[in-house]
Interface confidence: low
């Protein structure tokens, strides 16, 4: 019988308390093959974290501070449940800290040095952690004592609970330094007061700061946020300009063999016997015995954090950014104007040969990371491992719900001004063989697939969007007799046509022969009856110009494309035959690494791109033997976004409504976590 | 302000040999990774060879074997050793700090190497 037990770490007497009583009364309402609590007793939080690691305790509620310190090595703790506040219609598991100023005053965030800062409390997040962490490596040096180099990046302050004798400065603009609200300028409030009241140029605050204190529109129109990226924004705007993104109260486990859906079924139980108004006699969320007791007071109730939310996507790049400058202190040796290497994502084997062949001659400029799917890549560039990578418009969505930005495009098509003009986009197309005559797009019903990968655009998301529509349900492995779509689960039908050998059977990468473009056209040619590719794929494998074995006597002519009206058409009529306009792929990169990325890959296309004549003996950035290793092949160049500069505007609102539907159906994990921080 | 400086261009007969040194002020060279760039006449601007701050090198296949990259940081200067140049080499050669920030690159004004006989 497997051991249902929740062992809960108490860090106080009183939290000890509340947790026998919890566990007394959850046995009273629980079947007794339930989950059941047991009460572990420790000194402190962080002894806690020690006892999860060491499995001597399965968990315990932390703020974002701790939660970093639980995810640390060798404690390697995890994110499993969230406390949430306001209503179950609207529930809020994340602060915003932010930067508050008056709409007036003309400085951005890189001009904060010789301001006037306010502050809401020495060693408290919103209010200085997470401000001076990433303001970390502009201070002056000497960096220790941290408080006297903020003193001295100010030029003046009032951070409640400083040492005013050490550090008078911090206390200039609130005599004393006062550490409670007999300080008027003590605390979110008191800081945004300092603000109000012409003290400070700027307040380091939360994002309901403003609301709270000013209920007229008209009076919070006086004030600005300050982004990160070096602009202002309204401050209603708080979810597109912030410092951090911040988790109130969490629960953690271990990151193996942590009973995270042991502790789901506890909690997910106790909120709906114990929760907001359910009981009298307890309360999971009140403490009559002191405050916080094991939850917040405030909380209203837990929510699941998906299972491919590691602490550090939880946590968001900005906050852990901040912690760790604050914690360890280091700071790279170049200075602000120059730009590190680009870290470039390669997926699998034959794209890292390529990026490692880029590197040398980059000179340096383009470092390679590994990963084995194009969501674990996304999830390296969202923590910092990474930096940027080229995607299809499918995992640009995702991309872009994760925070990403999309710094320059793909384009396909020669013109004398290739990357000064981005193109509008490439079609998604259905192929069929010419023999099979009587396939149309409305009898695919229990026919054999083809799909680039499950995500993609030409592969997946235009066509099985369309049938969506039209079978409304998304067991697509049904609608087909058997298929190829990487990325499927394995037993699923739709890896049964896959030709990867072992463990690489209908991976999303290149080590699935019918991965990608090429991939899914080989699959038509070898097994299938339908591919679902993009307009260019068949005049680019067939004629010869392709040299691989299965494809060097192919002929366009034997392949014809389905149009939505039933009808079908020759290969070469694509435009009036296609499922959708794609939009092209794009390079993605967090918004702070945008400016180099851009740059860098612009000089990068410059010594290695389409202008290169001989790739036999020259590195070429686009060419990869019909491979679309780290690009597609086709590329002529990438070309500046212009104002298509954020995920919506580049894919288009259509498509974006389109993947938007077919959000019911999507197996990313990835997605799932990125749309709990940012639904 | 950084400012480079380059020097040592001139006539040369192929199979002949040059030295060209690139001088920087300000506090860039010490941390950059530095690149040779050259113009032919009526052409577009080509890479020659680069090197980081730790002193790794880099060439374009034409110039392999027979150009050298080498830096001296305490003495902020930045050096191609130029052997058995060929006709095609003519140019005007430009070094630059080839990774700094926003598109503020920094670029010296060049010197001429001609290769004719």
């Known amino acids: 019988v497997p051991d249902k037990t929740v062992r809960w770490c108490a860090v106080s007497e009183h939290e000890a308390t509340k947790c026998q009583s919890f566990r007394d009364h959850m046995k009273s309402v629980i079947p007794s093959d339930g989950p059941s609590v047991a009460c572990v007793k420790k000194a402190s939080y962080l002894d806690c974290i020690r006892a999860i690691a060491a499995n001597e305790a399965d968990a315990v509620t932390l703020d974002a501070g701790l939660v970093y310190d639980a995810y640390l090595a060798p404690n390697n703790l995890k994110p499993v449940v969230a406390e949430f506040y306001g209503s179950k219609e609207d529930p809020q598991t994340f602060y915003y800290a932010v930067a508050v100023v008056k709409k007036d005053s003309g400085f951005q965030m890189n001009q904060l040095r010789g301001k006037k800062s306010c502050h809401t409390g020495l060693g408290r997040s919103a209010g200085w952690n997470i401000p001076i962490g990433l303001l970390y490596c502009d201070l002056p040096e000497p960096r220790k004592p941290l408080e006297k180099a903020v003193a001295n990046f100010f030029s003046g302050s009032c951070a409640p609970c400083a040492d005013g004798t050490d550090f008078p400065q911090l206390c200039q603009l609130c005599p004393g330094c006062g550490c409670s609200t007999l300080n008027q300028y003590f605390g979110y409030s008191g800081a945004f007061k300092c603000l109000k009241d012409g003290a400070g140029d700027v307040a380091f605050v939360k994002h309901s700061t403003i609301f709270e204190n000013l209920a007229n529109k008209a009076d919070r129109d006086q004030y600005e946020l300050l982004c990160l990226d070096n602009t202002r924004k309204p401050v209603d705007e708080y979810k597109d300009c912030h410092l951090a993104q911040v988790p109130s109260h969490t629960v953690v486990a271990r990151s193996m063999g942590g009973k995270e859906d042991l502790i789901w079924e506890l909690l997910n139980q106790a909120q709906e016997h114990f929760g907001k108004d359910k009981s009298k006699e307890f309360q999971l969320f009140s403490s009559p015995h002191g405050k916080d007791l094991l939850f917040k007071d405030s909380a209203h109730g837990f929510l699941k954090v998906p299972p491919r939310m590691d602490a550090k996507m939880y946590l968001g790049y900005e906050y852990v950014t901040a912690i760790r400058n604050l914690r360890e202190g280091t700071c790279p040796e170049a200075p602000t104007d120059e730009c590190k290497p680009v870290k470039w994502c390669a997926l699998s084997h034959h794209e890292r040969l390529k990026c490692d062949e880029w590197s040398v001659n980059s000179v340096g400029k383009i470092e390679c990371v590994s990963a084995e799917t194009t969501e674990d890549c996304i999830a390296k560039i969202m923590n910092g491992e990474a930096d940027a990578m080229s995607l299809d418009g499918g995992f640009v969505y995702i991309a872009g719900k994760c925070g990403l930005v999309p710094v320059l495009a793909e384009n396909y098509n020669k013109s004398d001004n290739c990357e000064d003009t981005p193109e509008a986009g490439y079609f998604a197309i259905a192929v069929v063989k010419k023999s099979a005559s009587d396939l149309t797009w409305d009898n695919l019903k229990g026919k054999k697939s083809c799909h680039t990968a499950v995500g993609r655009t030409a592969g997946w998301n235009i066509p099985m969007g369309l049938l969506y529509n039209k079978i409304n349900h998304c067991r697509f492995d049904e609608f087909f007799s058997e298929g190829c779509a990487p990325g499927s689960k394995k037993d699923s039908s739709l890896c049964k046509l896959c030709m990867g050998s072992g463990l690489n059977l209908c991976e999303p990468n290149n080590k699935e022969g019918y991965y990608g473009y090429t991939g899914a056209f080989r699959c038509l040619v070898e097994k299938g009856d339908v591919a679902f590719v993009k307009h260019q794929t068949v005049p680019q494998n067939t004629g010869g110009k392709n040299p691989d074995p299965w494809a060097k006597n192919l002929n366009e002519k034997d392949y014809e494309l389905l149009c939505l009206d039933g009808t079908r058409k020759p290969v070469e009529e694509y435009a009036n035959c296609h499922l959708a306009r794609a939009p092209n792929h794009a390079v993605v990169t967090r918004k702070d690494k945008e400016a180099c990325v851009h740059k860098i890959l612009r000089q990068q296309q410059h010594l290695f791109g389409s202008n290169v004549t001989d790739c036999s003996g020259n590195f070429c950035l686009f060419r990869s033997e019909t491979k679309d290793l780290l690009f597609r092949d086709d590329t002529v160049c990438l070309a500046k976004l212009h104002d298509r500069n954020t995920y919506e505007k580049y894919l288009g609102e259509e498509y974006v409504k389109a993947v938007g539907n077919l959000r019911k159906c999507s197996t990313s994990s990835l997605l799932e976590a990125c749309t709990f921080r940012r639904p | 302000e950084v400012q480079l400086v380059e020097s040592g261009g001139g006539l040369v007969q192929p199979g002949g040999s040059l030295r060209l040194s690139c001088a920087a002020s300000?506090?860039?060279?010490?941390?950059?990774?530095m690149a040779w760039y050259r113009q032919a006449p009526g052409k577009g601007l080509e890479w020659v060879a680069g090197i980081t701050r730790s002193g790794s090198t880099n060439y374009r296949d034409s110039v392999k074997g027979r150009f050298t990259i080498s830096r001296d940081n305490s003495k902020n200067t930045m050096y191609l050793q130029m052997n058995s140049l060929r006709a095609e080499d003519t140019a005007v050669y430009y070094c630059?700090?080839?990774?700094?920030?926003?598109?503020?690159?920094?670029w010296g004004q060049g010197t001429l190497v001609t290769v004719s006989s």
């Open positions: 630059t700090d080839y990774s700094s920030r926003y598109y503020h690159d920094y």
């Open positions: 300000g506090s860039i060279f010490s941390i950059a990774t």
